[in-house]
């Protein structure tokens, strides 16, 4: 019996087609992805093949103005339209709190939403009961397939699930649910979840009875053969893991942003054992036409977005200096504003010992593309912020050793004075440079804001200590020459859309007046 698994993950609000780098589509003839194009390909496969499941491994939420405006209603609407069969909860599904998940998505989705390792307690338990499930058995042709869900247990540090949801260890939570499916004589079981490729592989290895793992969170690109676009494969598709009980378990993921549709064909024997598995992600490029009815619906929903981008988010009573002449040479108040917003967006008081789990931000000055003049009545709009942060990136959480941070700050000024983009703006950090010293030895003081303290204060950076830092995904991926970050990071969790982080902060503060306050000094 053959099953076709179509899968997406980490779509992050890319409902419209995008450029090849998943930013805003500029030249339509070279654009990719989007739900209208995805639907065309899904329908084509559904017509051609008998047993097809369309699955999503989480993080539909967060990433573009679509989510900012529609807050998840767009996810439910278009996933329903595409007739998804199941979805696993990702960490970003909690970005607007549990209510922001329940109302727009859980109550509106016409497909099961899954996670076996999230347990509700207190008053939330009865409110959310039945709205998401640990697993679902789906009839496919003449057979049944069990789908069991899981979500990163780090979600309380990455999003806003509140205090009434407990995120358990994935493997511990999955095993009894898979055992339960076995008692129902379900012998074909897919683990669908959002904990990253390393955990996906562990689940394949450790959870008895799981036949296939469809993952997300780490934006992993797997491919067999010559890859069709810029993404470099982390391994073959499917990636085969040998389980502890000796089975070959295919593990798949489909990069991110709706650029690819994962396509996996699995052949099962009559006892539900995987005999063979093969496939590849399908690049959703312009050779696949956009479905006209879905496209028309997208255009209808788009109208509200255009109105939103010119509405006032808040006011500034000072000039927001985002000029290259400032932000690539010295501390600039636009850099301070953005870093303050990045830290504010990551306030998670999850432990009495820590005032917060993260206190530091770094931001490449070259990523700040425009100032905002306060003389336009002080008004700040989404449109203004899109000029400051035009690349559609995310502000991510990483863990780095102090020694890596020191290297990053040396890199920040290794060729100072040439208006290059690697000059770092900061938050929760005091740095002093001596440009008279040779490159690689110019950081003379580097103090960082403590987290395990009741009164935050600045202490010298310790080389062997592990620190959490918020930074643009561009830097986490080694951009602007920050190869040491990419090579040495100990953990990387993708965060919220950059503009959304700053716009939310401005809306919250209502009136802003960031200053240049001595975060970056030259001796």
């Amino acid at each position: 019996w053959e099953l076709t698994i179509l899968h997406t993950n980490d779509v992050h609000s890319r409902l419209e087609q995008t450029s090849e780098d998943s930013s805003k589509c500029v030249n339509a003839s070279r654009c990719m992805g989007g739900v209208a194009r995805l639907f065309t390909k899904v329908q084509q496969i559904r017509r051609a093949e008998p047993n097809v499941l369309l699955l999503d491994a989480g993080d539909q939420y967060q990433g573009t103005i679509w989510f900012t405006v529609y807050k998840g209603a767009e996810v439910a609407h278009f996933m329903n339209a595409l007739r998804y069969d199941a979805m696993a909860l990702g960490n970003h599904e909690f970005d607007n709190g549990v209510e922001g998940l329940i109302e727009p998505l859980l109550k509106e989705a016409k497909f099961p939403i899954l996670s076996a390792n999230i347990k509700a307690k207190g008053p939330l338990a009865s409110q959310i009961s039945g709205l998401y499930l640990p697993y679902k058995v789906l009839p496919v042709g003449d057979e049944v397939v069990g789908i069991v869900g899981y979500t990163s247990k780090e979600t309380p540090f990455l999003s806003n699930p509140g205090t009434n949801l407990v995120f358990e260890d994935e493997i511990t939570a999955l095993q009894p649910e898979v055992d339960k499916l076995k008692t129902l004589n379900v012998n074909k079981i897919i683990a669908l979840g959002h904990s990253g490729f390393e955990m996906d592989k562990l689940i394949a290895q450790k959870v008895r009875g799981v036949d296939v793992v469809v993952g997300g969170h780490s934006n992993t690109f797997l491919y067999t053969g010559n890859p069709p676009s810029k993404e470099v494969p982390a391994g073959k598709y499917p990636f085969i893991v040998t389980s502890d009980d000796g089975r070959k378990v295919p593990v798949v993921q489909a990069y991110a942003f709706g650029k690819y549709l994962g396509y996996l064909k699995i052949e099962f024997d009559e006892r539900g054992n995987v005999i063979s598995s093969h496939g590849n992600p399908i690049l959703l490029n312009s050779s696949i036409p956009e479905d006209p009815s879905i496209k028309a619906d997208i255009n209808k929903w788009r109208i509200k977005l255009d109105n939103y981008s010119t509405q006032e988010l808040g006011k500034t009573i000072v000039y927001l200096d985002g000029s290259s002449q400032s932000c690539r040479f010295r501390e600039c108040n636009m850099g301070n504003l953005i870093c303050d917003a990045m830290i504010n967006n990551n306030l998670r008081h999850t432990d009495e010992m820590f005032w917060n789990h993260v206190s530091m931000c770094i931001l490449n000055g070259g990523g700040i593309r425009s100032p905002i003049d306060e003389r336009n009545n002080g008004t700040i709009t989404w449109e203004n912020l899109a000029a400051v942060l035009p690349f559609g990136g995310t502000f991510d959480l990483v863990q780095l050793k102090g020694s890596t941070l020191k290297k990053a700050f040396e890199h920040s000024v290794h060729r100072y004075g040439q208006s290059t983009g690697e000059f770092l703006q900061v938050g929760g950090i005091h740095v002093v440079y001596d440009l008279s010293r040779k490159p690689g030895d110019r950081v003379v003081k580097l103090d960082v804001l403590c987290t395990k303290c009741r009164v935050p204060s600045y202490d010298p950076l310790k080389m062997d200590e592990v620190y959490k830092v918020i930074l643009p995904n561009f830097l986490a991926n080694g951009g602007d020459g920050f190869q040491m970050i990419k090579d040495e990071l100990l953990r990387h969790d993708s965060g919220d859309q950059d503009i959304n982080v700053v716009s939310t902060y401005i809306s919250k503060m209502k009136v802003i007046y960031p200053a240049v306050e001595g975060r970056i000094k030259f001796s």
Epitope: V137, P139, D142, L184, N185
Partner: antibody, heavy 119, light 107 residues
Framework: QVQLVQSGAEVKKPGASVKVSCKAS????????IHWVRQAPGQGLEWMGA????????SYNQKFKGRVTMTVDTSTSTVYMELSSLRSEDTAVYYC????????????WGQGTLVTVSS | DIQMTQSPSSLSASVGDRVTITCKAS??????LAWYQQKPGKAPKLLLS???SLETGVPSRFSGSGSGTDYTLTISSLQPEDFATYYC?????????FGGGTKVEIK
């Protein structure tokens, strides 16, 4: 609305068989299990087994395996339960009930069929 | 098989009383517990599933709680139409099993 309508009461002799029917309407018949639960006079409820009309898959309570047969006719949305080698302790009301494939609680029940086993 | 032990087997109460029925499973059932109400000569009626999920149309005076092996059905203010027999059922492990029932009678 969802309805499960069962066949009428039966009186059988020990050693005989009885076949009870359950006709479903008001929902997609092939996407839910039909379970059989019996209740002896003045006693509690006992699950006998279930059939999934989508593919004919059956799960049994081992206590009844070999004596109970469940079949389905999708053209009429009807499930049948046959119990053989009847004995007096099989005298009970037999209910069919609808349940999710994956979470077997019973949200709709038939009206029940009284089967009396008496010589 | 998982044994479901319900207590008490019967109780007498008055209209307006708060009534609690407990159900103990012989092993963990991971919150896969349902409660039913049955009146004489009628089929059982589903009240709650997943320990706490109230079925549509069931009055909010019925509530469920518990985890692991111990579960409770509470009727906050007993009404005349609530006099009936109540059953718990586990749906974690085949064969699905019911408690012995609790008959709620008028005092």
């Amino acid at each position: 609305q969802v309805q499960l309508v069962q066949s009428g009461a039966e009186v059988k002799k020990p050693g005989a068989s009885v076949k009870v029917s359950c006709k479903a309407s008001g929902y997609t018949f092939t996407t839910y299990n039909i379970h059989w639960v019996r209740q002896a006079p003045g006693q509690g409820l006992e699950w006998m087994g279930a059939i999934f009309p989508g593919n004919g898959h059956i799960s049994y309570n081992q206590k009844f395996k070999g004596r109970v047969t469940m079949t389905v006719d999708t053209s009429t949305s009807t499930v049948y339960m046959e119990l053989s080698s009847l004995r007096s302790e099989d005298t009970a009301v037999y209910y069919c009930a609808r349940g999710d494939y994956d979470e077997s609680y019973f949200d709709y029940w038939g009206q029940g069929t009284l089967v009396t086993v008496s010589s | 098989d998982i044994q479901m032990t319900q207590s008490p087997s019967s109780l007498s109460a008055s209209v307006g009383d708060r009534v609690t029925i407990t159900c103990k499973a012989s092993e963990g059932i991971y919150n896969r517990l349902a409660w039913y109400q049955q009146k004489p000569g009628k089929a059982p009626k589903l009240l709650l599933s997943g320990v706490i999920s109230l079925e549509t149309g069931v009055p909010s005076r019925f509530s469920g709680s518990g985890s692991g092996t111990d579960y409770t059905l509470t009727i906050s203010s007993l009404q005349p139409e609530d006099f009936a027999t109540y059953y718990c059922q586990q749906y974690w492990s085949i064969p699905w099993t019911f408690g012995g029932g609790t008959k709620v009678e008028i005092k």
